[in-house]
């Protein structure tokens, strides 16, 4: 029978139907349109951007298309009273500042409204002393400093580059070392690609290049000042002392330039070893302080941004489905951007405008998938996932009850080398199927499939023949969905080759030279990119829309359940006498991961044989299905971090980009032979570890027969 | 208590290479820095380079750079000195030292370069 | 390469009696000099950080001082179990380098 009961397509056609119809040429039509001013969160621009895309998505067909908004925390400089670093001399005299604007892009030079750069939600303040060097201000390097070099960081500026992990992670461990106030910068090491010029005539950062973004650790929260609920009309908000996840010191962002000016002068204590030394030509001595004939100067830094409520708008549009209009797939990608947002956001809005686009054809001829598709354009992720969070915040409800997928789609590249997918167990089955059948856009890869060049340049670190699928972390759109709802999520981009690239990122991230240009000369000239990329995502929600069974298989999750089981196991028993002394046992957690893999197994082989014809059985399979991502959160969720409830997947409580398996036990164990108290630290690792096989249990339990 | 014991005395002839180990136990072995130092009979001490044990970031004094390889098996908190290419005046006691201020010391390896 | 010249080569001291221990950088290091104590047929022992710190169970009779490039190293009360060989490090610039050393004998 059909998968797709509600056209008057031939079926087998659909999905090829709606692949064919999406076009690079198109795809590039609407990055140019997105990307000519900023969209700024809470600006006029962004308000105005919002409107076009609600009137082109009816236009393409949907069945509705409205403007959610919240009224939520943003962050702004003060236009008159710029923020800036100085080196001051004894007399209190700068006698050097840092630049106050990025030097515009070929052609944008009388673009109003760039914002300068800037650490979103920094705190006003004007600290001045000594700097110290923190490399990338991650929780080992503060170990580092702290531990074996015996640096106090308390009272002191501390400068960290960009890179590794999330910013905001940064800061919140300088806060943590009692620093007084924290410069961010970009080192060649990693926003400097060997043999690439710089923008304009390459894809590298120039040295007035400055990366911005939010320095907030919300941990899931959403509006700082609405935690758990929506920013709306007749919102209760806390005050700003009681908001969560500001930072408490001045923070603020500076390119190489910039940094070369104060790293030159660094004294004290030479750097450890060569993993704290960047491509500056300076020593990346750590301090404290300056060397020799400058040691009487400071560091000053003069920051005066401001924190305001401002409305911020989502464009949710809908597309009805024919048989099952009360599951919901979602495909959400955000719309504001630093700057012009080349690359993030416009890149993934693009394709996103293309997918409704080739969905809205298939409709207009007759068609509707089996189950109903929303697309969301988010605001204000930028500053914290906002608009995501908030309209997810406000829907929970009918979420929790009717959510099938999430799909994210920010950047569409990162890179131009291979496919990248995090997603949940649950959806590897379809990625690969899919990749096996679109064709892959890499040279030297003509006629073969998406998945064969991307298993070959990206394989699977455990199993051969198999590409790398990683697990989700944070940073971006789905995380409310995943973290929060346990709403099965996935995510696709082109990315760079991690071998031979070892910068952060993509060099020009949230800078001013984050244009269309940037794109369209360097990264994708043709668009075959990001129509892989269109094609992937789109494959992904149209085969979660419309197949009649759920394409999840439950028992991946099985797999991986097992993989994270013997990690975490093997982390343990680095102490064996203490889980000797106090009686640590995994056993309950191996034995829920068995029981697991064997109704996994059972429920696999039921899925294969059940009538589905019959639409109550087909139905109860579905939901079966649906609520197992669901069956994952504990409604307490993680210890201090309320808002991530999913018990397999976590943040990373060092870098909010990157995913943690067992995330409770995890941060159990963490650093461990350092409490305290040890009689207290492994009772609270044996209670995780509780958690963790009652969740798993809990969640088996769900694959069962229900009768 | 923290302990650092390095493997035993070894004799070796010109041209050839010689490998140390320093096995480490009573801390946490990815938190200091391992330096290897040497001491001529009779002579001060020289620094020969050091590694980061939790990423294997190293740096070595150029003056033996090419000839040392400093190395780390993070599962047995073992740290490794390789000198290649030998010569007479490589004669000296080689110890490991943990912390970034040589906070601990192995027991010292004695290495004799001779014909 | 900073080289660090350390002064006296030797110097002989009643029991109970001040010792003072020099040290000087070929240029300036700022605060990053260590101090150590090696007695005949044993490793180094670390004493001072951060050319004043003493390192934990270090006895107070032990003060470092200085900054730039002259520091020193002090002795308040000469005891039997002092008679090694002092040696200053700079960990301010690579290659990180020693002093000669200071031998401290009983008068």
């Known amino acids: 029978k059909s998968s797709n009961e509600a056209t008057n397509i031939t079926p087998k056609h659909n999905m090829k139907a709606f692949l064919d119809e999406l076009k690079a040429e198109n795809i590039k039509k609407f990055l140019y349109n997105f990307t000519q001013i900023p969209h700024l969160a809470g600006t006029e621009q962004n308000f105005q951007l919002a409107k076009q895309i609600q009137s082109q998505w009816k236009e393409f067909g949907l069945d509705s298309v409205e403007l959610a908004h919240y009224d939520v925390l943003l962050s702004y400089p003060n236009k008159t009273h710029p923020n800036y670093i100085s080196i001051i001399n004894e007399d209190g005299n700068e006698i050097f500042n840092t630049s106050l604007f990025e030097p515009p892009p070929p052609g944008y030079e009388n673009v109003s409204d760039i914002v300068p750069p800037f650490s979103a939600f920094s705190p006003q303040g004007m600290p001045e002393g000594d700097l110290v060097y923190v490399n990338y201000a991650r929780t080992e390097d503060f170990f580092k400093l702290e531990r074996d070099m015996k640096i106090n960081c308390s009272g002191k500026i501390v400068i960290a580059r960009y890179g590794k992990v999330f910013r905001g992670n940064k800061v919140k461990n300088a806060q943590l070392a009692g620093a007084k106030g924290v410069i961010l910068y970009s080192d060649p090491a990693d926003y400097f690609a060997p043999g690439v010029k710089s923008y304009p005539d390459g894809w590298n950062l120039p040295g007035g290049g400055v990366q911005r973004g939010n320095i907030l650790n919300l941990n899931g929260a959403g509006d700082p000042l609405t935690p758990g609920y929506p920013a709306n009309e007749y919102a209760y908000r806390r005050g700003i002392a009681e908001a969560v996840g500001l930072p408490s010191i001045p923070v603020h962002p500076i390119g190489y330039y910039d940094a070369q000016k104060l790293l030159e002068k660094m004294g004290g204590s030479a750097p450890p070893d060569s993993s704290w030394r960047g491509s500056l030509k300076v020593p990346y001595n750590v301090g404290p302080g300056f060397t020799g004939n400058f040691s009487t100067q400071k560091v000053k830094m003069h920051i005066h941004s401001t924190n305001e409520v401002t409305r911020i708008y989502n464009v949710i549009g809908t597309l009805r489905g024919a048989v099952e209009p009360d599951r919901y797939v979602i495909l959400g990608g955000h719309r504001d951007s630093w700057v012009f947002g080349g690359i993030d956001p416009q890149s993934g809005a693009a394709v996103v405008h293309e997918i409704v686009r080739s969905f809205g054809t298939l409709k207009k001829e007759g068609w509707r998938p089996r189950r109903t598709i929303l697309f969301a354009s988010w605001d204000a992720e930028e500053f914290g996932l906002l608009g995501s969070t908030e309209w997810a915040e406000e829907n929970s409800r009918l979420l929790q009850e009717r959510g099938v997928a999430y799909i994210n789609a920010d950047s569409s590249i990162e890179g131009n080398y291979t496919l990248r997918v995090d997603c949940t167990p649950l959806m590897y089955s379809l990625v690969h199927n899919l990749t096996k059948e679109l064709k892959s856009p890499d040279e030297g890869f003509e006629g073969k499939s998406l998945y064969e060049s991307w298993t070959k340049k990206s394989p699977s670190p455990e199993f051969s023949g198999m590409p790398r699928i990683s697990k989700l972390g944070s940073g971006n759109d789905f995380e409310v969905f995943f973290q929060r709802l346990g709403i099965a999520s996935g995510r696709a981009r082109y990315t760079k080759n991690w071998e031979t690239n070892k910068f952060s990122g993509y060099p020009l991230y949230h800078s001013v030279y984050e244009t269309y240009e940037l794109v369209e000369k360097f990264y994708d000239p043709m668009f075959k990119y990001h129509l892989t990329v269109a094609q992937v995502r789109g494959g992904m929600v149209f085969e979660l829309a419309n197949s009649i069974v759920l394409p999840f298989d439950c028992r991946d999750y099985a797999v991986v359940l097992r993989k994270y089981a013997d990690k975490i196991y093997s982390i343990s028993m680095k102490h064996p006498q203490e889980m000797k002394t106090y009686s640590v046992s995994f056993d309950s957690l191996f034995s829920a991961v068995k029981n697991f893999t064997e109704i996994a197994s059972k429920f696999s082989e039921r899925l294969q044989d059940f009538d589905k014809s019959n639409p109550i059985v087909l139905r109860m399979m579905n939901d079966q299905l649906m609520f197992l991502e669901r069956a994952f959160i504990d409604p307490l969720g993680l210890p201090d971090r309320p808002f991530y409830r999913h018990v397999i997947y976590a943040p990373s409580s060092h870098n909010k980009y990157a995913g943690e398996s067992f995330p409770g036990i995890y941060d159990a164990l963490f650093d461990i032979e350092s409490k305290v108290d040890p009689s207290k630290a492994w009772g609270e690792v044996k209670r995780q570890i509780y958690v963790a096989a009652f969740t798993v249990q809990a969640a088996a339990e769900t694959l069962s027969e229900v009768a | 208590e923290v302990q650092l014991v390095q493997s035993g005395a070894e004799v070796k002839k010109p041209g050839a290479s010689v490998k140390v180990s320093c096995k480490t136990s009573g801390y946490t072995f990815t938190e200091y820095t391992i330096h290897w130092v040497r001491q001529a009979p009779g002579q001060s001490l020289e620094w020969m380079g050091n590694?980061?044990?939790?990423?294997?970031?190293?740096t070595y004094n150029q003056k033996f750079q090419g000839r040392v390889t400093i190395t780390v098996d993070k599962s047995t908190s073992t740290a490794y000195m390789e000198l290649s290419s030998l010569r007479s005046e490589d004669t000296a006691v080689y110890y490991c030292?943990?912390?970034?201020?040589?906070?601990?010391w192995g027991q010292g390896t004695l290495v004799t370069v001779s014909s | 390469d900073i080289v660090m010249t350390q002064s006296p080569d030797s110097l002989a001291v009643s029991l109970g009696e001040r010792a003072t221990l020099s040290c000087r950088a070929s240029q300036d290091v700022g605060t990053a000099v260590d101090w150590y104590q090696q007695k005949p047929d044993q490793s180094p022992k670390l004493l001072i950080y951060w050319a004043s710190t003493r390192h934990t169970g270090v006895p107070d009779r032990f003060t470092g001082s200085g900054s730039g490039t002259d520091f020193t190293l002090t002795i308040s009360s000469l005891q039997a179990e002092d008679v090694a060989v002092y040696f200053c490090r700079q960990y301010n610039s690579y290659p990180l380098t020693f002093g000669a050393g200071t031998k401290v004998e009983i008068k």
């Open positions: 590694i980061n044990p939790n990423n294997g970031g190293t």
């Open positions: 030292a943990a912390g970034w201020n040589f906070d601990y």
